[in-house]
Amino acid sequence: IPVIEPSVPELVVKPGATVTLRCVGNGSVEWDGPPSPHWTLYSDGSSSILSTNNATFQNTGTYRCTEPGDPLGGSAAIHLYVKDPARPWNVLAQEVVVFEDQDALLPCLLTDPVLEAGVSLVRVRGRPLMRHTNYSFS
């Protein structure tokens, strides 16, 4: 099972920070994360490093490392917050298409974990949500 350094589940940094994420496995490893700018990838056998010297709010998200050759299929993850007061959200999509009566996933990431307690969902121009709409955040 691969291991990520730094060895924390969450990493909170300021915009412009240098961030280094290292994944080590027994065999070759691969990174999966939000499509975002400024990352440089260095791979060396069983180690892979994601690095940026100019983190932005767009780098906010969960970065997962997997070892394709691992029969157990284990993975490791770290969630990065780039805490930008001017950009509380990292919106990953401008439009989401769903079928009627099905669940909709709105991919919208907070850049600061402190804001999580005060999040609610409203429609544009403050109109109330449609009746029978249940929503939750993950």
């Epitope: 291991v3 350094e5 730094p6 060895s7 924390v8 589940p9 990493l11 909170v12 300021k14 240098t18």
Partner: antibody
Framework: EVKLEESGGGLVQPGGSMKLSCAAS????????MDWVRQSPEMGLEWVAE??????????FYAESVKGRFTISRDDSKSSVYLQMNSLRPEDTGIYYC?????????WGQGTTLTVSS | DIQMTQSPASLSVSVGETVTITCRAS??????LAWYQQKQGKSPQLLVH???NLADGVPSRFSGSGSGTQYSLKINSLQSEDFGSYYC?????????FGGGTKLEIK
């Protein structure tokens, strides 16, 4: 409010065993990484062991000084983490803290004292 | 294993002074450093994470800096409640070693 409460400390003879418990509340325990840290006047603060969340395969890690003697485990249904300590030595004496890892050791319990002495 | 060397071991200062505590890692820890404050008879409390980020509720007179192997914690205009012990700790893999601590005493 996050709360961590350790129990199970006491006096034990060298070579003996002891199990520490930590009861957690105020957060989603099953998502949390949990660690044990100990403190003594001789060694200062010393990281002991870690157990990660189910999403991280409940992976465990140990300090070299306790490897093979201590076992960290968790029961997500009881929001509790445990430290089974065997083959105890006098140098294992100290205050044992249960901690939650987020961006660092964000929350600490009040500690439970273990004394290993004959 | 990464070793953390903290200095000074103790410091005698007056209220209102500014102090700086330093921590050196034996190898690059890429800013993955935390600082803790511990008051007599109490559990440690997180002050700073990722080298420069203040934990929730920590007064702005505290600040962390550094990169690579060299890090510091600065306390401006010391208040009486700031006296106690301070520890650094790295999070670049395991084992997660702590510095030896700095005891801040009132002059």
């Amino acid at each position: 409010e996050v709360k961590l409460e350790e129990s199970g400390g006491g006096l034990v003879q060298p070579g003996g065993s002891m199990k520490l418990s930590c009861a957690a509340s105020g957060f989603t325990f099953s998502d949390a990484w949990m660690d044990w840290v100990r403190q003594s006047p001789e060694m200062g603060l010393e990281w002991v062991a870690e157990i990660r969340s189910k999403a991280n395969n409940h992976a465990t890690f140990y300090a070299e000084s306790v490897k093979g003697r201590f076992t960290i485990s968790r029961d997500d249904s009881k929001s509790s983490v445990y430290l089974q300590m065997n083959s105890l030595r006098p140098e294992d004496t100290g205050i044992y803290y249960c901690t939650r890892v987020k961006v660092g050791f964000d929350n600490w319990g009040q500690g439970t004292t273990l004394t290993v002495s004959s | 294993d990464i070793q953390m060397t903290q200095s000074p071991a103790s410091l005698s200062v007056s209220v209102g002074e500014t102090v700086t505590i330093t921590c050196r890692a034996s190898e690059n820890i890429y800013s993955n450093l935390a600082w803790y404050q511990q008051k007599q008879g109490k559990s440690p409390q997180l002050l700073v994470h990722a080298a420069t980020n203040l934990a929730d509720g920590v007064p702005s007179r505290f600040s962390g800096s550094g990169s690579g192997t060299q890090y510091s914690l600065k306390i401006n205009s010391l208040q009486s409640e700031d006296f106690g012990s301070y520890y650094c700790q790295h999070f670049w893999g395991t084992p997660r070693t702590f510095g030896g601590g700095t005891k801040l005493e009132i002059k």
